[in-house]
């Protein structure tokens, strides 16, 4: 009998997907409802536990006991600002158990609390069962994907969820990397290609730049936003219709959880419709206090409601290009991943940003990640299929890793965006005469001083024979495995004595937001990035001014105060500028400022005529934060030149 296949699971924030590589190709497996993606939802009722479609379908009836977004909690502490922020938006209760978040629900008449790992394990169990029903035999081996910026804690917790689900987790891989594998299999041409993967899903957004060369994948840079996706677009629609309901019926439904949940379901359906139609209808019977809510929305209005969110997707694209040290003209292929990339405006913004370059939509955006995970699972199980045998995967470390040397200096051994797995060794020495030991303090971050970076862990190497400063040779090795787990070893070369530390989930690694903040702070102190900050500032000023002017002249209160000719003049110029902005997000500061001044030249004389005595409206200012203070501890180890 042929050996059991390993599966690839895309464990998504809102939806999950499972695939298997067999007979030389990937099969994405449909669930018992015939759907190729399954909601990452778990519901608890008085009689049963529901997972997937069944859980999501009853969410309006049972919101407090229907858990979703476990991925936003997994591997995080309760006090994490992300957790605290997200909690405000969830209908289910999150409690604090020793600074670990737990979801509290009512199940079979009892109050139960589950760790995020347990909730995720239930979703993984469902995905495992879907695969088993298709394959006809038990499945144990799996590759599971996570967002590119998940830290060790989050990766380890995801692995734990797999174990709880009865899976042998072969590897945790990045979602964009998995998508690249899927894409790579479609490529037969030779020569190096730079590929940008734009992954906009239900809850997270990742941009990755990879080079693919004859089956070898290398991640050059990653960027993104763990809190941007389809749900955010749904929220904009929900808010829009809550306001519409207020206007039409003079009633506020926002505090009625069931009504809002039903509205959200209808909004999600409408959003999907708007990807293929220019208008969508909503028909919700007895939405609130017996009132039927029948309405519609155009694609244009939806695009306006989400315009800032859509445009914000280009910022990580710019960042990834900078990190990869590539110009947009050097990108050969653009790959769309995630259901939200079906939105025409999102596609247009990306296409315009890349000067009309065709987007690669050949891969079903909902399935690409699971597809790649399934391929990787086959590789790790030793599949000798011609399609996969030469495939090599190189991932990256999202932040520089190093240790503290004399004077609190951050000495990086592994640079940010280094491909992993990787191993780097450097020789250090003592700072004082007859120093008996060294304290190895491991940090991640981009700042020059360790006090501004994140301490991952520390350990001591003692028993160094007495010697003048600078004589002992301490060999320090940083080793990151394929799952991004870091091992740091220090060895005294004269005695062979060694000590080590493994940085894992209990060491409080950083969230994606913190990673981005640290990277931004580090860049802020580099002269060349001052230019970038000014550029973004000029862009934001132009964008704000254009939208403010557009809103100002469209204000119903101005009817009769502004001539149609003047209104048209302003709107035409705003349209010109907004369209130009959409197509030129990487323009120079001078260009943004020029456009703003051009727009002001048109608008200010007209607007000032409306608001006699007041100055013409202009863009807001942008504050800058100085470096934070703090004192470092005394030197313990010195770098050898």
């Amino acid at each position: 009998m042929a050996k059991a296949a390993a599966i690839g699971i895309d464990l998504g924030t809102t939806y999950s997907c499972v695939g298997v590589f067999q007979h030389g190709k990937v099969e994405i497996i449909a669930n018992d409802q015939g759907n190729r993606t399954t909601p990452s939802y778990v519901a608890f009722t008085d009689t049963e536990r529901l997972i997937g479609d069944a859980a999501k379908n009853q969410v309006a009836l049972n919101p407090q006991n229907t858990v979703f977004d476990a991925k936003r909690l997994i591997g995080r502490k309760f006090g994490d600002p992300v957790v605290q922020s997200d909690m405000k938006h969830w209908p289910f209760q999150v409690i604090n158990d020793g600074d670990k978040p737990k979801v509290q629900v009512s199940y079979k008449g009892e109050t139960k609390a589950f760790y995020p790992e347990e909730i995720s394990s239930m979703v993984l169990t469902k995905m495992k069962e879907i695969a088993e029903a298709y394959l006809g035999y038990p499945v144990t081996n799996a590759v599971i994907t996570v967002p590119a910026y998940f830290n060790d804690s989050q990766r380890q917790a995801t692995k734990d969820a797999g174990v709880i689900a009865g899976l042998n987790v072969l590897r945790i891989i990045n979602e964009p990397t998995a998508a690249a594998i899927a894409y790579g299999l479609d490529r037969t041409g030779k020569g190096e290609r730079n590929v940008l993967i734009f992954d906009l899903g239900g809850g997270t957004f990742d941009v990755s730049i990879l080079t693919i060369d004859d089956g070898i994948f290398e991640v050059k840079a990653t960027a993104g936003d763990t809190h941007l996706g389809g749900e955010d677009f749904d929220n904009r629609l929900v808010n829009h219709f809550v306001e519409e309901f207020k206007r039409k019926h003079k009633k506020d439904i926002s505090q009625n959880k069931r009504a809002v949940r039903r509205l959200r379901t209808a909004c999600e359906r409408a959003k999907r419709t708007l990807s293929s139609s220019t208008q969508a209808s909503l028909e919700i019977d007895s939405l609130f206090e017996g009132i039927d809510f029948y309405t519609s929305i155009t694609r244009a209005r939806f695009e306006e409601l989400c315009s800032d969110l859509f445009r914000s997707t280009l910022e990580p694209v710019e960042k990834a290009l900078r990190d990869a040290k590539l110009d947009k003209a050097q990108i050969h292929d653009l790959v769309l991943v995630g259901g939200s990339t079906r939105i025409p405006k999102v596609q247009k913004l990306l296409q315009d940003f890349f000067n009309g370059r065709d987007l690669n939509k050949s891969i079903n955006p909902d399935e690409a990640v699971a597809y790649g995970a399934a391929v990787q699972a086959a590789i790790l199980m030793g599949d000798k299929s011609e399609n996969v045998q030469d495939l090599l995967l190189l991932d990256v470390a999202p932040l520089s890793l190093g240790l503290e040397t004399a004077g609190g200096v951050m000495t990086a051994l592994i640079k940010r965006n280094s491909t992993i797995p990787t191993k780097q060794t450097q020789i250090f020495t003592t700072y004082s005469d007859n120093q008996p030991g060294v304290l190895i303090q491991v940090y991640e971050g981009e700042r020059a001083m360790t006090k501004d970076n994140n301490l991952l862990g520390r350990f001591e190497l003692s028993g160094i024979p007495p010697a003048p400063r600078g004589v002992p040779q301490i060999e320090v090795t940083f080793d990151i495995d394929a799952n991004g787990i870091l091992n740091v070893t220090a060895t005294d070369k004269s005695t062979g004595k060694a000590n080590k530390i493994t940085i894992t989930n209990d060491k409080g690694r950083l969230s994606k937001e913190e990673i981005e903040r640290m990277v931004q702070e580090a860049e802020k102190y580099k002269a060349e990035d001052e230019v970038q900050r000014e550029r973004v500032s000029a862009k934001n000023a132009l964008e704000s001014y254009a939208f403010n002017m557009k809103s100002a002249v469209e204000d119903e209160g101005l009817k009769g105060k502004i001539s149609e000719a003047d209104k048209k003049k302003v709107l035409d110029k705003c349209q010109e500028v907004i369209s130009w902005l959409d197509a030129n997000t990487l323009a120079e500061k001078d260009e943004f400022e020029h456009k703003r001044k051009e727009l002001e030249q048109v608008c200010n004389p007209i607007i000032s005529g409306l608001y006699q005595g007041a100055g013409g409206p202009g863009p807001g200012g942008f504050g800058a934060q100085g470096p934070k203070g703090g004192s470092g501890s005394g030197p313990t180890i010195e770098e050898v030149d």
Epitope: A583, K597, E598, E600, N604
Partner: antibody
Amino acid sequence: QIQLVQSGAEVKKPGASVKVSCKASGYTFTNYGMNWVRQAPGQGLEWMGWINTYTGEPTYADDFKGRFTFTTDTSTSTAYMDLRSLRSDDTAVYFCARYDHAMDYWGQGTLVTVSS
Amino acid sequence: EIVLTQSPDSLSVSLGERATINCKSSQSLLNSGTRKNYLAWYQQKAGQSPNLLIYWTSTRESGVPDRFSGSGSGTDFTLSIDSLQAEDVAVYYCKQSYTLYTFGGGTKVEIK
């Protein structure tokens, strides 16, 4: 009718400064931007930059940053172009031009000659 | 910076014949929102100031004879003078205003 009248020709020594004026009439000065264009002898047109006449904010083309300054006096509907540390290659005719959808009205030009 | 390349540098055309001047941009001048190409054409007669002929690729400035027409989109543009008159002898410049402004190098039109 709309007119842009520029100041007369100037002959200057290298290192000196010059200020060219451009007086607008026949329209509301602060409603339209004022551009400056240079044309060296026998050469083509070079866009130097422009000034937002409402806010007074100038924009300079890359080759014209540093020694050039654009200003306005809205009380007299006049735009000015200042050039300091004159060099021989600054010898040219300098035009001002009003901007609507394009440069629709031009001054007659001011010849600045830099010679030792 | 957008570079505009005009061709030919000079052109000799018989009276009454058609003159065609080309202008190629280093990047697209099309704004997809307004569906306009931000390219203008200017005429400069000897010893005079330039004069606006056409903006937004094909919109004639008021008072400009209809023998002058502009066409093109994206990166390739053309100014046509349908039936060349003696008073059309001049240097013609294209100019982009898609982002900042730049002029082309000019094309001298003479009578053959």
